[in-house]
């Protein structure tokens, strides 16, 4: 059974992940120059189901494509450091989902733009955090 300390640690990690995802989304949305619309041509894959920490496997598998899109953004004077940011997210995701059980991600038929993708995982984090508090 999870202890209060492990629950607290999970909550803090989720909050960190949430902040990172929100920072990327805000960076896209707040960047007034619509030159970044080219990022919207990239396709992201969404989980068929995302209700448990193990479903973060689906996010982990999309981190490399996310980094590639952010690299394009950076070349257009978008001030995020994609490699560092994605590396941080990857570490948190690996800790949260655990490596004890191998989970095969199932993807939904519908794909998403980077904005839709980030919003989906932000909602996931918020949902899990709310069950822990």
């Amino acid at each position: 059974a999870p202890t209060s300390s492990s629950t607290k640690k999970t909550q803090l990690q989720l909050e960190h992940l949430l902040l990172d995802l929100q920072m990327i989304l805000n960076g896209i949305n707040n960047y007034k120059n619509p030159k970044l619309t080219r990022m919207l041509t990239f396709k992201f894959y969404m989980p068929k189901k995302a209700t448990e920490l193990k479903h973060l496997q689906c996010l982990e598998e999309e981190l490399k494509p996310l980094e590639e899109v952010l690299n394009l953004a950076q070349s257009k004077n978008f001030h995020l450091r994609p490699r560092d940011l994605i590396s941080n997210i990857n570490v948190i995701v690996l800790e949260l989902k655990g490596s004890e059980t191998t989970f095969m991600c199932e993807y939904a038929d519908e794909t998403a733009t980077i904005v839709e993708f980030l919003n989906r995982w932000i909602t996931f984090c918020q949902s899990i955090i709310s069950t822990l508090t």
Epitope: P34, T37, L40, T41, F42, K43, K76, T111, T113, V115
Partner: antibody, heavy 122, light 108 residues
Framework: EVQLVQSGAEVKKPGESLKISCKGS????????IGWVRQMPGKGLEWMGI????????TYSPSFQGQVTISADKSINTAYLQWSSLKASDTAMYYC???????????????WGQGTTVTVSS | SYELTQPPSVSVSPGQTARITCSGD??????AYWYQQKPGQAPMLVIY???ERPSGIPERFSGSSSGTTVTLTISGVQAEDEADYYC???????????FGGGTKLTVL
């Protein structure tokens, strides 16, 4: 009404220079990328390059890099495509088109000009 | 350079279903767009984001995607649908826009 209006047909001789135009109206011209597309007689569409009129940032297709120059004058909402020395093989229809977008979606080339016919012949 | 491959021609009888395919290595990661071009006219967007229809485009036009192939489907084809159809996407870096070679749809 959102529209792109292109300059009229041109007949030129090989070696001459040419600049054709594409004027946008009905939207914020500086906030949307404008692309140029070539269509040679009886052939398909070829993407030449694109410009962001807000700051004139430009990307060329590798096939057209160094062959043409894409520019824009945001004060008069107009994008340009120019040649310094025309060749017979430049004979084609040239279209300008706007890259449309929304808050979280990219609409592709959603508005097109009517096209400018360029004929290069001695 | 990156290429999108389309069949040169597709023929179909009125009322039947026409399917036009477009294949490219980057299509699993880049959205596709479809344009209709009738003789003497500028191209017109008929599908964006693989499967979305702009306002004013009839419901018989639909798009789908599977792996490295996207498909434009025209259900209950009408004589007025006879035209050239082009798919368009971007290379894997998102830097360059690319068109397919075009497909001539003939309504028999």
């Amino acid at each position: 009404e959102v529209q792109l209006v292109q300059s009229g047909a041109e007949v030129k001789k090989p070696g001459e220079s040419l600049k054709i135009s594409c004027k946008g109206s009905g939207y914020s011209f500086t906030s949307y990328w404008i692309g140029w597309v070539r269509q040679m007689p009886g052939k398909g569409l070829e993407w030449m390059g694109i410009i962001y009129p807000g700051d004139s940032d430009t990307t060329y297709s590798p096939s057209f890099q160094g062959q043409v120059t894409i520019s824009a004058d945001k004060s008069i909402n107009t994008a340009y495509l120019q040649w310094s020395s025309l060749k017979a093989s430049d004979t084609a229809m040239y279209y300008c088109a706007r890259e449309g977008f929304g808050e979280s979606i990219h609409y592709g080339l959603d508005v097109w000009g009517q096209g400018t016919t360029v004929t290069v012949s001695s | 350079s990156y290429e999108l491959t389309q069949p040169p021609s597709v023929s179909v009888s009125p009322g039947q279903t026409a399917r036009i395919t477009c294949s490219g290595d980057a299509l699993p990661r880049q959205y596709a767009y479809w344009y209709q071009q009738k003789p003497g006219q500028a191209p017109m967007l008929v599908i964006y984001k693989d499967s979305e229809r702009p306002s004013g485009i009839p419901e018989r036009f639909s798009g789908s995607s599977s792996g490295t192939t996207v498909t434009l489907t025209i259900s209950g084809v009408q004589a007025e649908d006879e035209a050239d159809y082009y798919c368009q996407s971007a290379d894997s870096s998102g830097t360059y826009v690319v068109f397919g070679g075009g497909t001539k749809l003939t309504v028999l």
